[in-house]
């Protein structure tokens, strides 16, 4: 008789999840030699231990602490790039501007990027059929709690000028319910962070509006100012040109506004 299994609303664990996490960890130690000392087997064991045999709606930040400890990493605190709803461009940017880091450029972010995972209460099985959806099922699921934990730690580590890339094509350019709006904004440390600089990325070629005047950006400015952190905002009208100018800053066309 097949054992009854909880059916969740979200997609199941990414196929070959253990192999993917291990392979990513090994690859990370290769491309980031300063993390050579990381024991990828122990990292996987800690990752697995955070959610295996636990109810996937009852995961806590505490469950991830062993993994957080093993993944401890120092990134330059003044070179942090946050993003919201515009991950691909943020990653393209840090691939060119190698001294800046998104969360996914750190070991733990790199391991989990674009993956889904969950287990089942009281069994050592990984659930490849379905996992809880944040809205439809529960917020304290393995994936959401992981990203909340690493995002909080990443924001807490930031200092000086912190940059955030925001998607100007969305109805809410700044969304209070995003990870950036609900976690990172509130965990920037005013005693360390002087300024949050928003880069609003325009979608349309002919879009010359000043999206820094958008009501949601004003809301972000208000939240940040109340936290005693200065706020500044720049329009990036041409993201393609923006990336090109990061690659080739000497290009004569890169002196004008992008």
């Amino acid at each position: 008789v097949p054992r009854w299994r909880q059916q969740w609303s979200g997609p199941g664990t990414t196929k070959r999840f253990p192999e993917t996490v291990l392979a990513r960890c090994v690859k990370y130690t290769e491309i980031h030699p300063e993390m050579r000392h990381v024991d990828c087997q122990s990292v996987w064991d800690a990752f697995k231990g955070a959610f295996i045999s636990k109810h996937p709606c009852n995961i806590t930040e505490e469950d991830y602490q062993p993994l957080m400890k093993l993944g401890t990493q120092t990134v330059p605190c003044n070179k942090i790039l946050l993003w919201s709803r515009i991950k691909d461009l943020a990653h393209q940017f840090t691939q060119v501007q190698r001294d800046m880091f998104t969360l996914e450029d750190t070991l733990l972010g790199y391991l989990a990027d674009d993956l889904t995972w969950c287990g089942e209460f009281n069994t050592s099985k990984i659930n490849y059929q379905s996992c809880p959806d944040w809205r439809k099922d529960c917020s304290n699921n393995p994936v959401s709690v992981f990203w909340k934990t690493v995002s909080r730690r990443f924001a807490e580590a930031a200092c000086d000028v912190v940059h955030v890339m925001l998607n100007g094509s969305r109805s809410k350019i700044f969304d209070k319910n995003s990870t950036f709006g609900s976690v990172e904004v509130h965990n920037l440390q005013p005693e360390k962070v002087q300024t949050l600089e928003a880069w609003v990325i325009h979608g349309g070629r002919e879009d010359s509006r000043d999206l820094c005047q958008d009501p949601t950006i004003k809301e972000l400015e208000s939240i940040i100012s109340k936290r005693n952190i200065q706020f500044s905002c720049k329009n990036i009208y041409r993201p393609d040109k923006f990336l090109q100018c990061v690659k080739n800053p000497e290009d004569s066309s890169c002196t004008s506004e992008i």
Epitope: L22, V26, K27, T29, E34, V38, D39, C40
Partner: antibody, heavy 114, light 107 residues
Framework: QVQLQQSGPELVRPGTSVKVSCKAS????????VEWIKQRPGQGLEWIGV????????NYNEKFKGKATLTVDRSSTTAYMHLSGLTSDDSAVYFC???????WGQGTTLTVSS | DIVMTQSQKFMSASVGDRVSITCKAS??????VAWYQQQPGHSPKQLIY???NRYTGVPDRFTGSGAGTDFTLTISNIQSEDLADYFC?????????FGSGTKLEIK
């Protein structure tokens, strides 16, 4: 327990080549990178390069490009270093080592002499 | 390539003494520094990683410190078995590079 067992000493002629092996046991071979290090008698240590046993990708010290070639055989959990165009300058002890926890092989002595 | 300079080629100490072996990097390597001990006739053994973290099983007499360009390995309450060569290594950037080594002699 983790072990890296290297092949025995080699005495070879100048101009020839040699393949040094490093048999890994006691851990999941593809989960840790393997690096190679050269030590000449009474001298310091020189880093040759590193290989990812899972993907086969390598990073070499520029100085050893064309001299050393790193490979792995996953089925036998063995890493290899092929050294070509040997000269007396290549006479040394060669070590393999594993990333994380710094496990080292016992070393392979290479003597290049006519 | 990053040059790791160990200026003390030899150091001499008595059992129970404390010595500090220094290593200077030619550019900032953060904390990506390891220390190795090589006893006569043996393979190097890693003592310290990330500048200050001891590997399991390494006696707490061995302490690493430093960041950026200046690093120190301190051995306190020296024992006769500490007779060895000590090497620093940076692993911040490929190619990894080693210091030339410091030979610790026991009086």
């Amino acid at each position: 327990q983790v072990q890296l067992q290297q092949s025995g000493p080699e005495l070879v002629r100048p101009g020839t080549s040699v393949k040094v092996s490093c048999k890994a046991s006691g851990y999941a071979f593809t989960t840790y990178l393997v690096e190679w290090i050269k030590q000449r008698p009474g001298q310091g240590l020189e880093w040759i390069g590193v290989i990812n046993p899972g993907s086969g990708s390598t990073n070499y010290n520029e100085k050893f490009k064309g001299k050393a070639t790193l490979t792995v055989d996953r089925s036998s959990t063995t890493a290899y270093m092929h050294l070509s165009g040997l000269t007396s300058d290549d006479s040394a002890v060669y070590f393999c080592a594993r990333y994380a926890y710094g496990y080292w092989g016992q070393g392979t002595t290479l003597t290049v002499s006519s | 390539d990053i040059v790791m300079t160990q200026s003390q080629k030899f150091m001499s100490a008595s059992v129970g003494d404390r010595v500090s072996i220094t290593c200077k990097a030619s550019q900032n390597v953060g904390t990506a520094v390891a220390w190795y001990q090589q006893q006569p006739g043996h393979s190097p053994k890693q003592l310290i990683y990330s500048a200050s973290n001891r590997y399991t099983g390494v006696p707490d007499r061995f302490t690493g410190s430093g960041a950026g360009t200046d690093f120190t390995l301190t051995i306190s309450n020296i024992q006769s078995e500490d007779l060895a060569d000590y090497f620093c290594q940076q692993y911040s950037t490929y190619p990894f590079t080693f210091g030339s080594g410091t030979k610790l002699e026991i009086k």
